[in-house]
């Protein structure tokens, strides 16, 4: 038996590794948007600039009509940045007016809409207060987090005010997944 | 009301490298991709590339190895070299803004014919 | 890159005609087709954008419809201004490419 090699009992089974290449992803930049027609109880969608710029798509990863598709089941990270800019006036005003086309928060959600469910689902939702900062005011809110996404889903980013989002800069306004 | 205004010399010879400016007035030059597009004689339009206010390219394929833009967001203009040039490039020349790819190009400069001769 | 052809290459009409154009993409290229006017010695005017949205200022019997690689514009009642050549164009990718133009002339 002198210099005979054993096989271990349980020997593990590797699968070949996938190359990040590959796989879904895209990173999408703010745009100049249109007034459009949303959703009874649904903040607004966010259009944006799928191949210019810094924007991408890539591995079937597909932009279309304000949604990214996703292409295929698994873990995805999810992300989005907001930039919001206006003034402080706009706060008194609300109060003084009743304008309740200006608020005095911001908020941005990322949804998800699957075909087979019939209400969209809010995956990850960020507020912040605008009437306690400066007098021209710039407010990021940046959200991100890991979900399990189906084939067919689809994802968008909803503001509470689209005429406030900043988007001058793609580095400031942007929203992106990648399959891990 | 935005202008665009393209100017440089009508005439290049072979070889040599053409140079187009683009002045943008009544508007900044930032947070929009500013085009290219040439439309030679009897043709189509050609794309030639774009450039973004942050300095950023892309270009036609077709053109990449002869083509460089730049950009001045200090004076609102921004430019084209086409090196090694023929007599196939010769075209009207036009630069145009396209705010994202969902808006097409919005606004465009009146041309400027570029003629390659000897 | 994706090829964008139209049809007719030339039509005649008269003016108060209904005329249509149509451009075909040779892949998908969602909704990102625009449409243009060029008249000679000027510059393409941008008519509508997005498939079907009609820019600032322009009248609204232009219109333009489709998804996908097959697409089309309508005039509802063609103007002695309309006149002109007509362009389509895919801003789905770069490079951007235009079809070769549809000439409209005076029947």
């Known amino acids: 038996l002198k210099g005979q090699e054993f096989a271990p009992s349980h020997q593990q089974v590797y699968a070949p590794l996938r190359a990040d290449g590959d796989k879904p992803r895209a990173h999408l930049t703010v745009v100049r948007q249109t007034p459009t027609q949303h959703f009874k109880n649904q903040f607004p969608a966010l259009h944006w600039e799928h191949e210019l710029g810094l924007a991408f798509t890539k591995n079937r990863m597909n932009y279309t009509n304000k949604f990214l598709l996703i292409p295929e089941s698994g873990d995805y990270f999810i992300y989005s940045q907001v930039t919001f800019r206006g003034m402080t006036s706009e706060c008194s005003e609300i109060r003084q007016a009743g304008r309740p086309n200006k608020p005095d928060s911001i908020t941005v959600v990322i949804t998800k809409v699957t075909d087979s469910y019939p209400e969209p689902t809010q995956l990850l939702m960020g507020t912040k207060s605008v009437c306690e900062v400066g007098s021209n005011w710039f407010q990021p809110i940046y959200l991100g987090a890991m979900f399990s996404l189906q084939e067919g889903d689809k994802l968008m980013v909803n503001v509470s005010d689209i005429s406030l989002v900043d988007y001058t800069k793609e580095d400031k306004t942007f929203f992106g997944a990648f399959l891990l | 009301q935005v202008q665009l205004q393209e100017s440089g010399p009508g005439l290049v010879k072979p070889s040599e490298t053409l140079s187009l400016t683009c002045t943008v007035s009544?508007?900044?030059?930032?947070?929009?991709?500013w085009s290219w597009i040439r439309e030679p004689p009897g043709k189509g339009l050609e794309w030639i590339g774009y450039?973004?206010?942050?300095?950023?390219?892309n270009y036609n394929p077709s053109l990449k190895s002869r083509v460089t833009m730049s950009i001045d967001t200090s004076k609102n203009q921004f430019s084209l070299k086409l090196s090694s040039v023929t007599a196939a490039d010769t075209a009207v020349y036009y630069c145009a803004r396209e705010i994202g790819s969902y808006y097409g190009f919005d606004y465009w400069g009146q041309g400027t014919l570029v003629t390659v001769s000897s | 890159d994706i090829q964008m052809t139209q049809s007719p290459s030339s039509l005649s009409a008269s003016v108060g005609d209904r005329v249509t154009i149509t451009c075909r993409a040779s892949?998908?290229?969602?909704?990102?087709l625009n449409w243009y006017q060029k008249k000679p010695g000027k510059a393409p005017k941008l008519l509508i954008y997005a498939t079907s949205s009609l820019q600032s200022g322009v009248p609204s019997r232009f219109s333009g419809s489709g998804s996908g690689t097959d697409f089309s514009l309508t005039i509802s009642s063609l103007q002695p201004e309309d006149f002109a050549t007509y362009f389509c164009?895919?801003?789905?990718?770069?490079?951007?490419?235009f079809g070769q133009g549809t000439k409209v002339e005076i029947k």
């Open positions: 164009q895919q801003s789905y990718s770069t490079p951007r490419t």
């Open positions: 450039i973004y206010y942050s300095g950023s390219t």
């Open positions: 892949q998908s290229i969602n909704n990102y």
């Open positions: 009544g508007g900044s030059i930032s947070s929009y991709f």
